[in-house]
């Protein structure tokens, strides 16, 4: 069977006026997954995102991440889109200093 991913969105200061937002998916099986940032509902160009490899996390499941840099104050226009084993979900950027948003999808 399949194990749905835990999705976690974090933000960190990148440079003046910019932040890096990272979307991590973990503890999922099988390894096929779509993880991408969307701006105003449209997937960002590939050249503006950085992806981590899909790696085993030691429990027979997998983990990966995608990150992009955005302007501070425009967080509400960005969402992380996850698709796995026919299920999908969108995850907002946490506001302010809230660093972790965990969502488990069934």
């Amino acid at each position: 069977g399949s194990v749905p991913p835990m999705v976690n969105v974090t933000r960190s200061e990148a440079s003046e006026g910019n932040i890096t937002v990272t979307c991590r998916a973990s503890s999922f099986y099988p390894r096929n997954i779509t993880l991408t940032w969307r701006q105003d509902g449209v997937s960002l160009s590939h050249d503006t995102q950085q992806w981590g490899d899909v790696l085993p996390d030691g429990n027979g499941t997998y983990q990966t991440w995608v990150a992009t840099r955005i302007c501070q104050g425009e967080e509400q226009r960005f969402t992380c889109y996850m698709e796995h084993s026919g299920n999908h979900s969108t995850h907002p950027v946490p506001s302010g200093n809230s660093h972790h948003h965990h969502h488990h999808h069934h």
Epitope: Q39, D40, G41, V42, S43, L44, S45, T48, C71, R77, E83, G86, H88, T90
Partner: antibody, heavy 121, light 108 residues
């Protein structure tokens, strides 16, 4: 009032070039993504190209990729579509359309009146 | 690219009749990224149903939308004269974005 006014259409020979413009007013142009959508005579809508508010993300329909270039000049509130290697099948009414963001939903909420491009010898 | 095929291409309906049209995608589309637009001759398209099943502002309650994956539909519960128009589905799940082929609804 939100207004989008296209211009630049006309008669062009096959293989020729043309640049369409879309002048925006009544809203903060620099905060909205904009699309070009076309409609051939008596045909359906065909999405052509998209440019995000900050020009960071640009996409094209497969039918125009490599021939058309979308761009914008935010200080001048203007959107452009540079078209090259034009074909008869590019004959259509070209609309610019604003991509709204409202309550987490994105959609076309305002359209121009269109400009007609005819590609013929 | 995701191709959206609408059927029927043209349909005639009597006033009061129930009307259903479909939009079939060549690969799965999230319902969040599937909208329907209505267009009347000489006018720009208007958002009609968003995210597969939500009526846009001002759209009569006789309209409804449903579906998931590769199959979506728009239904008019009881056809009225003002509903005569062409309806297009539109997806932005994957780029390039695409519109459906359109369904023209006429009054019989």
């Amino acid at each position: 009032d939100v207004q989008l006014v296209e211009s630049g259409g006309g008669l062009v020979q096959p293989g020729g070039s043309r640049k369409l413009s879309c002048a925006a007013s009544g809203f903060t142009f620099s905060t909205f993504g904009i699309h070009w959508v076309r409609q051939a005579p008596e045909k359906g809508l065909e999405w052509v190209a998209y440019i995000s508010y900050d020009s960071r993300t640009i996409y094209y329909a497969d039918t125009v990729k490599g021939r058309f270039t979308i761009s914008r000049d935010n200080p001048k509130n203007t959107l452009f579509l540079q078209m090259t290697s034009l074909r008869s099948e590019d004959t259509a009414m070209y609309y610019c359309a604003r991509w709204a963001y409202e309550g987490g939903v994105n959609y076309f909420d305002n359209w121009g009146q269109g400009t007609t491009l005819t590609v013929s010898s | 690219q995701i191709v959206l095929t609408q059927s029927p291409a043209i349909m005639s309906a009597s006033l009061g009749e129930r009307v259903t049209m479909t939009c079939t995608a060549t690969s799965g589309v999230s319902s969040s990224y599937l909208h329907w637009y209505q267009q009347k001759p000489g006018s720009s398209p208007k958002l009609w149903i968003y995210s597969s099943s939500n009526l846009a502002s001002g759209v009569p309650a006789r309209f409804s939308g449903s579906g998931s994956g590769t199959s979506y539909s728009l239904t008019i519960g009881s056809m009225e004269a003002e509903d005569a128009a062409t309806y297009y589905c539109h997806q932005f799940h994957r780029s390039p974005l695409t519109f459906g082929t359109g369904t023209k609804v006429e009054i019989k």
